[in-house]
């Protein structure tokens, strides 16, 4: 299958998201809350491999003097804005006393700007991608991922945080959007719909896909997520659309097969390490990119979004498992956990390939309406 006016190459996919959780000191997970496989301290200790980011948080990276590359997560919740025709009605929300940013839900009160003023910002995510209006930018080189192939041990933490399923990623997963634009992966999570109802966050010419994966990254220029929030390029999210294909996706099955264990909100399990890059499309060269925000409170802006042109294929059964297994708070199913698309407000989406050129025979004179802003890079 192809994206509307987009080319899909090979079915693979992956994603993560720290964007779905607000940051704040109050939300730092405690050691007691989150037992995890970590490096013990000591003479032979390997620095920085021990602290895993916590489930509902974006990790903070400790200074090298303490532990090289060590990550801990701080809670980043998610919010929903009204107005989407397929707006989610699910009640997923977190209610932590003293933490306003954790009290929100999809498709209802409180209004997200009340949870976090940034949610009313001008440059929010997700957005509708219109390939014909995207600016072809040859300077956008293929993404580079390093260290995403993980051995089965130590295991990784998979958690139902009430608004998504999130896999906490260990230190050492490096991603480069280009020269000098280097990031470390923190976590990945998914967004989905319900039976017969698609649930991707981004859309393409108004078309919503069954689901979407987000892999959330922190710029290496910052030691902690809270330092990077709101800073241009401080966070970067790789996003890929998931759609139905004829075969089971073996990479996703390693996670989906464990969802029953974490059906209850707040529950978690340990899963063997896996090839995280196998959750993503195989074509790292064709993508759309724009600057937006976290798609949940605190909705911090300055997030670089990279949306793959190629989709990831999952079987119908796998997509059903994703949308029909987890529960949120208040005995409500965890479904339709996506935010409505937000206005571009003058932003231009860039493409790493000539997306505006329709390869179909009907397109006589394709027009590229916007030019690349980064042409001189």
């Amino acid at each position: 299958q192809r994206l509307p006016r987009m080319q899909e190459d090979s079915p693979l996919g992956g994603g993560s998201s720290g964007e779905d959780d607000p940051l704040g000191e109050e939300d730092l997970p405690s050691e007691e809350d989150s037992p995890r496989e970590e490096d013990p301290p000591g003479e032979e200790d390997l620095p920085g491999e021990e602290d895993l980011p916590g489930e509902e948080d974006l990790p903070e990276v400790k200074p090298k003097s303490e532990e090289e590359g060590s990550l801990k997560l701080e809670d980043l919740p998610t919010v929903e804005a009204p107005g989407d025709p397929q707006e989610p009605q699910n009640n997923a929300h977190r209610d932590k006393e003293g933490d306003d940013q954790s009290h929100w839900r999809y498709g209802g009160d409180p209004p997200w700007p009340r949870v976090s003023p940034a949610c009313a910002g001008r440059f929010q995510s997700p957005v509708d991608i219109r390939p014909q209006l995207a600016a072809f930018c040859p300077a956008l080189r293929p993404l580079e991922l390093l260290g995403f192939q993980l051995p089965p041990l130590p295991e990784l933490r998979l958690r139902n945080n009430g608004h998504s399923v999130q896999l906490t990623l260990p230190p050492g997963l490096e991603m480069a959007l280009g020269p000098g634009r280097e990031y470390r992966a923190l976590q990945l999570h998914l967004h989905w719909g319900a039976a017969g109802r698609p649930g991707s966050e981004h859309t393409v010419e108004g078309h919503r896909f069954p689901a979407e994966i987000h892999v959330v990254h922190l710029s290496t220029a910052f030691a902690r997520v809270d330092e990077a929030l709101g800073r241009p390029g401080g966070l970067a999210v790789l996003a890929a659309f998931l759609e139905e294909g004829p075969e089971e996706n073996s990479a996703y099955e390693q996670l989906l097969s464990r969802l029953e264990e974490i059906a209850e909100e707040g529950s978690e399990t340990q899963v063997p390490g896996l090839d995280i890059s196998a959750l993503l499309p195989s074509d790292f060269s064709r993508y759309f990119q724009y600057e937006g925000s976290l798609t949940t409170p605190p909705c911090a802006q300055g997030v670089i979004w990279t949306v793959f042109n190629q989709t990831v294929m999952l079987s119908a059964k796998q997509l059903h498992t994703l949308s029909d297994t987890l529960w949120g708070p208040g005995d409500s199913r965890l479904q339709l956990n996506f935010r409505a698309t937000q206005p571009l407000n003058g932003r231009v989406i860039e493409a790493s390939f000539p997306a505006g050129v329709d390869s179909s025979p009907r397109a006589a004179e394709p027009v590229q309406l916007n030019s690349c802003l980064a042409a001189g890079d």
Epitope: P35, R36, E37, E38, D39, P40, P41, G42, E44, D45, L46, E49, E50, L52, G147, F148, Q149, L150, P151, P152, L153, P154, E155, P170, P171, G172, Q270, P272, G273, D275, S277
Partner: antibody
Framework: QVQLVQSGGGLVRPGGSLRLSCAAS????????MSWVRQAPGKGLEWVSA????????YYADSVKGRFTISRDNSKNTLYLQMNSLRAEDTAVYYC????????????WGQGTTVTVSS | QSVLTQPPSVSGAPGQRITISCTGS?????????VHWYQQVPGKAPKVVIY???NRPSGVPDRFSGSKSGASASLAITGLQTEDEADYYC??????????FGGGTKVTVL
Amino acid sequence: QVQLVQSGGGLVRPGGSLRLSCAASGFPFSSYAMSWVRQAPGKGLEWVSAISANGGTTYYADSVKGRFTISRDNSKNTLYLQMNSLRAEDTAVYYCANNGNYRGAFDIWGQGTTVTVSS
Amino acid sequence: QSVLTQPPSVSGAPGQRITISCTGSSSNIGAGYDVHWYQQVPGKAPKVVIYGNNNRPSGVPDRFSGSKSGASASLAITGLQTEDEADYYCQSYDKSLTWVFGGGTKVTVL
């Protein structure tokens, strides 16, 4: 002080059994995956078996599959290797090691215990 | 026969730079799994000197460095010192669900 203290090695006849123990201290043992690695006399290192932090998942080298069993008792901070149907080629120094490094390295090692299989 | 291939021995004079190679395959190093290096002094347990291809644990001199390219990796020791005399092993993970080691390289300081 972070350490792994091993015990249980010794001389055993072919076909016999032995149980090795590895007591951990100085770190939250129950949060870490663990492995056994062995080294035959004058030879290199060979990974033998591994176990997840909660003990729910185990892995074995083909050479010991069906004969060795790895287990752990997190309440006692102890790792075990039950070795049955021992063969002469199992003669080696056995090390327990911590699989805590997310890049896949073994970062903490026990002092080693010698297992000799001979008639 | 070890899954990862290392030279049996490497030697150098004090102050020299030596490198130890480690060659794997598409099911281990070439599959993207990291390479780690251990130093083992006779009669002692191994000790990590490089993890994750090129990271040095605290306490390991910066004379030790690692690199990886494709299905191969290498360990370099610059400014070789007498205390560096030991056996060195590379290690990775293999898709066959096993952790794998190289056969070891004996480093001699002349």
